[in-house]
């Protein structure tokens, strides 16, 4: 007798846990932005505080009734959804409304810029506990609320938002597309994209994780003791706030990174149907539903790492697209992918005091994306090393020479254009452990790192057969911080992280007219942190 | 995540001396116009002007009242609904498109942007 | 079968805390489609809805007697309790414990009180 | 709160005749309301839930229709064991009860 959403996202191991802790006395307060709210619903009464924040635009239409009940529907489900007594994901957290959506569900962008300075005030007058706000809502992309979240999500506030009910790309709308916010899709009962009508949940490489948005049970704003289900991405953000709420509410301490580390970390992974997507946007996409995760006292010393991808480069002969990690972050590797296969490669270089990871479109490509490979590594210390290209028919070498550094990923940047340079199969016989080896013409990028019980090895899985991919995993205990398609492949697209899964692709064409000896390899750099341990590379 | 997606950015042409005005002339705007994509989100008529991150309280106020005075001088009245100050240093204002050029070269300016709606998901 | 069956002392003394348990029988109180609540009727007057709880023991109560109400519950008795502090001679009623729906499974049925016990008459006196 | 008021206080029927109860609320209750019966030195017992909908086990006679602040309970034919207190009560805010109509044989 549980709701198929609370079965979903909460581990059984929770559940009993949250039968002890009826109302928890939790210090977290969540700011929902939304509709007005029925505060004496049963659900929430006692837990909601209505602030006299009202910045809404006006009804539209002559006719049209405002009726409280109907006025107070969608922000009263998503309090429901936060913090309910009985259906909610955080039950007993303190939540705050803040009235951006007047009775239509519409708002604007100054009213929510308006409502986080509020929250930012109230933080200021008032320092309380961790602030989690949610963001039921959604618009066009909007480069100062995507600011504005930046600058909140500074102060330490955790900012969720809804990936938008559009069936497009997340990217294309705001505070969705924000790199500080938490942005959750919608799936249904069934772990699959939710369809609304001739929409849907949104995609893309601006969502963090899905989460149960269709068919929700929650508190109603027809009376007192009501429950409508409602669906939606602003139902599957808030499944994510409520379980933000909870991680916090246990460890108080835990950033805006470690948050998003641990949420992607134990989500429940590969279980959506990608072809819901387009598919130029399903490897951009998540494949993961949000499932509360245990404490740091229960699975500490993990390495946690995330893919991020970058914004597609455009055509043009010289694009570059850029990938950057959250501050708290270290990049440790960077790879590129290009549907056409024409790319010039990836390299990761500093601007503004931060490493991002960089990749560049050839001549005659469609375009390229960065892929950064971005973790959480308490007290690192990682620099990059690089060497110019080699001479024709000569490899480039790169290794960590620091001491008790250790080599977490390498990338590749062709200066030459002719990309028939770099089919001649390269000699990797030579091939040190803890080296990167470079194809031929191209400069060489290694990422070495130094933390306390860091250390790192090398796994290779190649196919000389026909094959669109070639894949290596790190197995259990490791985490993948670099993946490559290491040299002497014939044309691939690159090389990218799903999850601990590196994968290297390859061109279409070139698997007709590629010699069986000469192997696509997937190269993938795993490494564990063991605190106890000094830095090290496995052989 | 944070390129501009599929956004409207517009430079507008600006006359290089308005109204004969050396202090207005003095400053020549680098500062963009933004709004969004989608035509029937757009508010026109109102507008967030964004300031540089640097720009201090007083000179928040201060460009804002220097909008009034030179909108005031040209025959517009314009409305400063709110004040930002801290989250980002800017303001709201209600005022009529052809002002945007001007404002666009108020010193401490970094962007406009549009006022647009947003929906509940 | 559900039943329910109040028990607590009959009288009860002005400015004294009126203490009542409901026993649960036939089916576990826990359960995220129920609450469990206490309803009162004075003599030949109507019916008052006094407060709910679930079996986490989340709470609700009536607010004109919120300041003085408290029940609670225990999972591994399958009971819940009822106390009212400061009775005056208005308490004096017959108090009846009731099932309620959550409204949280749709399928445990309508949003409204049934099994009801089959009541407690206390009368405040001195 | 939201105040129920019942009427008639007492409805003197014979068996076979149709009894018809009213309640009316001090403001909309939408729909959320429900009908009791309670015979004596028993508890009550839900007939009509949700305005119109008979709960499980009631007999067709019983009917219940409204929306809003005004409601009738029906009772088609009297039958004796239906002589009893009928209590009207909403759910849209908390929960309150009506005053009471009782149905006593003529």
């Known amino acids: 007798s549980i709701p198929w959403n609370l079965e979903r996202i909460i581990p059984a191991w929770h559940q009993t846990e949250e039968d002890r802790s009826p109302d928890g006395s939790s210090q977290v307060e969540v700011y929902l932005l939304d509709t007005s709210i029925q505060g004496a619903h049963r659900e929430i009464e006692g837990r909601v505080t209505i602030t006299d924040f009202n910045s809404v635009p006006e009804e539209d239409g002559t006719r049209f009734h405002r009726q409280a009940s109907k006025c107070d529907s969608h922000g009263t489900h998503l309090a429901g959804v936060v913090s309910g007594r009985d259906a909610g994901v955080a039950k007993g957290t303190s939540l705050h409304s803040l009235r951006v959506l007047n009775c239509q569900g519409k708002g604007t962008v100054s009213g929510t810029l308006i409502g986080l300075e509020f929250i930012r005030k109230s933080q200021l007058i008032q320092p309380s506990g961790p602030l989690v706000v949610l963001l039921p809502l959604a618009g066009g992309y909007s480069r100062i609320l995507n600011a504005a979240c930046r600058h909140l999500a500074r102060t330490g506030v955790v900012l969720v938002a809804a990936a938008g009910n559009f069936r497009d790309d997340a990217c294309l709308y705001s505070p969705a597309s924000a790199p500080e916010v938490i942005t959750v899709g919608a799936t249904n009962a069934q772990d699959q994209p939710v369809t609304l009508g001739t929409l849907g949940t949104n995609f893309g490489r601006c969502v963090d994780l899905f989460a149960p948005g269709k068919d929700i049970i929650g508190a109603s704003s027809d009376c007192s003791t009501c429950f409508m289900s409602q669906s939606g991405t602003s139902q599957a953000a808030a499944h994510v706030a409520g379980i933000v709420a909870r991680m916090l509410s246990r460890e108080p301490t835990l950033t805006l990174a470690e948050l998003r580390q641990r949420l992607i970390h134990f989500s429940t992974k590969d279980v959506i149907n990608m072809a819901w997507f387009p598919e130029d946007q399903q490897v951009l996409t998540p494949n993961l539903v949000a499932t509360l995760p245990p404490s740091t006292h229960e699975t500490g010393g993990q390495l946690l790492c995330r893919t991020v991808w970058s914004a597609h480069s455009g055509p043009t002969r010289t694009a570059t697209a850029t990938a950057r990690c959250a501050p708290e972050e270290e990049l440790l590797s960077c790879s590129s992918f290009s549907r056409s296969g024409r790319r010039r490669g990836d390299w990761i270089e500093a601007i503004g005091g931060q490493q991002v990871c960089k990749a560049l479109n050839a001549f005659g490509g469609e375009g390229v994306y960065a892929v950064a490979r971005c973790c959480l590594v308490p007290r690192a210390n990682c620099s990059i090393h690089n060497t110019p290209a080699a001479r024709a028919g000569l490899e480039t070498h790169v290794h960590c020479h620091q001491k008790d550094h250790v080599l977490t990923g390498c990338s590749f940047h062709w200066e030459v254009e002719d990309l028939s340079v770099r089919r001649q199969p390269a000699l990797r016989s030579r091939r040190q452990p803890g080296q990167c080896v470079g194809h031929q013409a191209a400069s060489v990028y290694a990422s070495c790192c130094h933390a306390p019980g860091l250390e790192c090895k090398i796994k290779e899985h190649g196919i000389s057969g026909p094959s669109e991919q070639v894949t290596v995993a790190c197995e259990a205990g490791w985490t993948l911080t670099g993946c490559n398609v290491l040299p002497g492949a014939s044309l691939t697209l690159g090389a990218y992280s799903v999850d601990n899964l590196c994968v290297a692709r390859v061109h279409d064409t070139a698997r007709a007219d590629r010699t069986s000896g000469e192997a696509t390899v997937a190269a993938a750099i795993c490494c564990r942190s063991r605190p106890s341990a000094k830095a090290s590379w496995v052989q | 995540q944070d390129e501009d997606g599929d956004y409207e950015e517009l430079m507008l042409a600006l006359p290089s001396q308005e109204d004969g005005l050396a202090d207005e002339a003095a400053h020549v705007a680098t500062a963009t116009f933004r709004r969004c994509s989608k035509e029937a989100w757009r508010l026109p008529g109102t507008y967030i002007v964004v300031l540089m991150e640097e720009t201090q309280r007083l000179q928040i106020e201060q460009t804002a009242h220097r909008l009034q005075t030179r909108a005031a001088r040209r025959g517009y009245v314009i409305k400063v609904l709110h004040i930002f100050y801290d989250l980002f240093p800017g303001f709201l204002v209600k005022m009529s498109s052809d002002l945007l050029g001007l404002a666009l070269k108020l010193p401490h300016v970094e962007y406009i942007e549009e006022d647009s709606f947003v929906f509940a998901q | 079968q559900l039943q329910l069956q109040e028990s607590g002392p009959g009288l009860v003394k002005p400015s004294e805390t009126l203490s009542l348990t409901c026993t649960v029988s036939?089916?576990?109180?826990?359960?995220?489609?129920?609450?469990w609540g206490w309803i009162r009727q004075p003599p030949g007057k109507g019916l008052e809805w006094i407060g709910s709880?679930?079996?986490?023991?989340?709470?609700y109560y009536n607010p004109s007697l919120k300041s003085r109400v408290t029940i609670s519950v225990d999972t591994s008795k399958n009971q819940f309790s009822l106390k009212l502090s400061s009775v005056t001679a208005a308490d004096t009623a017959v108090y009846y414990c009731?099932?309620?729906?959550?409204?949280?499974?749709?399928?445990?049925?309508?949003?409204?009180?049934?099994?009801w016990g089959q009541g407690t008459l206390v009368t405040v006196s001195s | 709160e939201i105040v129920l008021t019942q009427s008639p206080a007492t409805l003197s029927l014979s068996p076979g005749e149709r009894a018809t109860l009213s309640c009316r609320a001090s403001?909309?209750?939408?729909?959320?309301l429900a009908w009791y019966q309670q015979k004596p030195g028993q508890a009550p017992r839900l007939l009509i839930y949700?305005?119109?909908n008979r709960a499980t086990g009631i007999p067709a006679r019983f009917s219940g229709s409204g929306s809003g602040t005004d409601f009738t309970l029906t009772i088609s034919s009297l039958e004796p064991e239906d002589f009893a207190v009928y209590y009207c009560?909403?759910?849209?805010?908390?929960?309150?009860f009506g005053g009471g109509t009782k149905v006593e044989i003529k």
């Open positions: 403001q909309s209750v939408s729909s959320y």
């Open positions: 949700d305005a119109s």
């Open positions: 009560q909403q759910r849209r805010n908390w929960f309150t």
């Open positions: 709880i679930n079996y986490r023991g989340s709470t």
């Open positions: 009731a099932r309620e729906n959550s409204g949280v499974v749709p399928a445990a049925g309508p949003n409204w009180f049934g099994p």
């Open positions: 036939g089916g576990s109180i826990r359960s995220s489609a129920y609450y």
